[in-house]
Amino acid sequence: VEVQVSEDPVVALVDTDATLRCSFSPEPGFSLAQLNLIWQLTDTKQLVHSFTEGRDQGSAYSNRTALFPDLLVQGNASLRLQRVRVTDEGSYTCFVSIQDFDSAAVSLQVAAPYSKPSMTLEPNKDLRPGNMVTITCSSYQGYPEAEVFWKDGQGVPLTGNVTTSQMANERGLFDVHSVLRVVLGANGTYSCLVRNPVLQQDAHGSVTITGQPLTF
């Protein structure tokens, strides 16, 4: 028996359902009584779901997994993972035993989009050219860790005096806070871009300083 899986990682958004595709080619006369299918976490070998002795043995993984029972006889051994969490990320092994056995691993990459950044300024009044200001760009509830880029009004990257911190919350999602310390010119726009490297999603925020008032 030969097991086939997608070579590319499966990308799933947090709280959505994901299908880990796995297939085999059944011989003529194949019956489900012959099939032994085991899904497990590749690294820890923790059992996720199994079908043995002619029946679905059910989920061994937080009751969020299911097979496609009607498609098994056609060689579809895919696994449905419901309400994906950050902790589900990793490699899953699909093991199929009939007359002989084979296995293959498929990777699950979890992602969550970042919120539109909010911008704060410190100090936020009585600003004069030549003042040192701190601009903070905050974006929330994304995964995996973000890439943060700062630019000025002319699109020139600002790399000096940038401090970025990323903190995971209890669900494993990251809140990003990036701080730019800059000396004000006569007026100017400062923009921050928060990029999710898996989703290739960019979230933009900017602040424009034109004397008074400030625009965000």
Epitope: Q40, F95, F101
Partner: antibody, heavy 118, light 109 residues
């Protein structure tokens, strides 16, 4: 070329344990089932148990359940068979074996003679 | 636990003769049956797997047949190197547990 090299002969006292190793080279260690088979002097072959390294699942013959432990170390491509509470009837040549694909044993180690004697 | 019975216990034949070895299972094993050859002082050698498939490098004079509970290993024309003990081995579907038969010794008549 697949090769299975087993550890050397052992002489053990009754009641003690023995651990035999089987180092595999050639092929992907994790992808094949490894069986342990023993043969007492002048007797037939006896399947003791086996392991599928990729699953980390070991299965044992009823006769040896609770007395044998089979493990596999994927990092060193080595399988181990430990037999405890040895008695004189456990004197035998112990073989490890693995297949080309699936379960059947195309390749065998050279055998390890375990002698249990007071 | 499935029990395998092999017959005859000993088969005495001359070179060139046809050898027919039988293996019977106490319950159906589908086609999960293999045959091994063992010579004195040597490790066993896989001849047939899945009841009827010849293993790599095994001469065409060896053939296997049967399914369910009754299986046969046939050596169409015995060669001097074929004198040995032959074991059948079954595997349960899941979990994969194996048992060997007691063996049939093929010796020179």
């Amino acid at each position: 070329q697949v090769q299975l090299v087993q550890s050397g002969a052992e002489v053990k006292k009754p009641g003690s344990s023995v651990k035999v190793s089987c180092k595999a080279s050639g092929g992907t260690f994790s992808s094949y089932a490894i069986s342990w088979v023993r043969q007492a002097p002048g007797q037939g072959l006896e399947w003791m148990g086996g392991i599928i390294p990729i699953l980390g699942i070991a299965n044992y013959a009823q006769k040896f359940q609770g007395r044998v432990t089979i493990t596999a170390d994927e990092s060193t491509s080595t399988a181990y068979m430990e037999l405890s509470s040895l008695r004189s009837e456990d004197t035998a040549v112990y073989y490890c074996a693995r297949g080309d694909s699936g379960y059947d044993s195309n390749y065998w180690g050279q055998g390890t003679l375990v002698t249990v004697s007071a | 636990e499935i029990v395998l019975t092999q017959s005859p216990a000993t088969l005495s034949l001359s070179p060139g003769e046809r050898a027919t070895l039988s293996c019977r299972a106490s319950q159906s094993v589908s086609t999960y049956l293999a045959w091994y050859q063992q010579k004195p002082g040597q490790a066993p050698r896989l001849l047939i797997y899945d009841a009827s498939n010849r293993a790599t490098g095994i001469p065409a004079r060896f053939s296997g047949s049967g399914s369910g509970t009754d299986f046969t290993l046939t050596i169409s024309s015995l060669e001097p190197e074929d004198y040995a003990v032959y074991y059948c081995q079954q595997r349960s579907n899941w979990p994969p547990l194996f048992t060997f038969g007691p063996g049939t010794k093929v010796d020179i008549k």
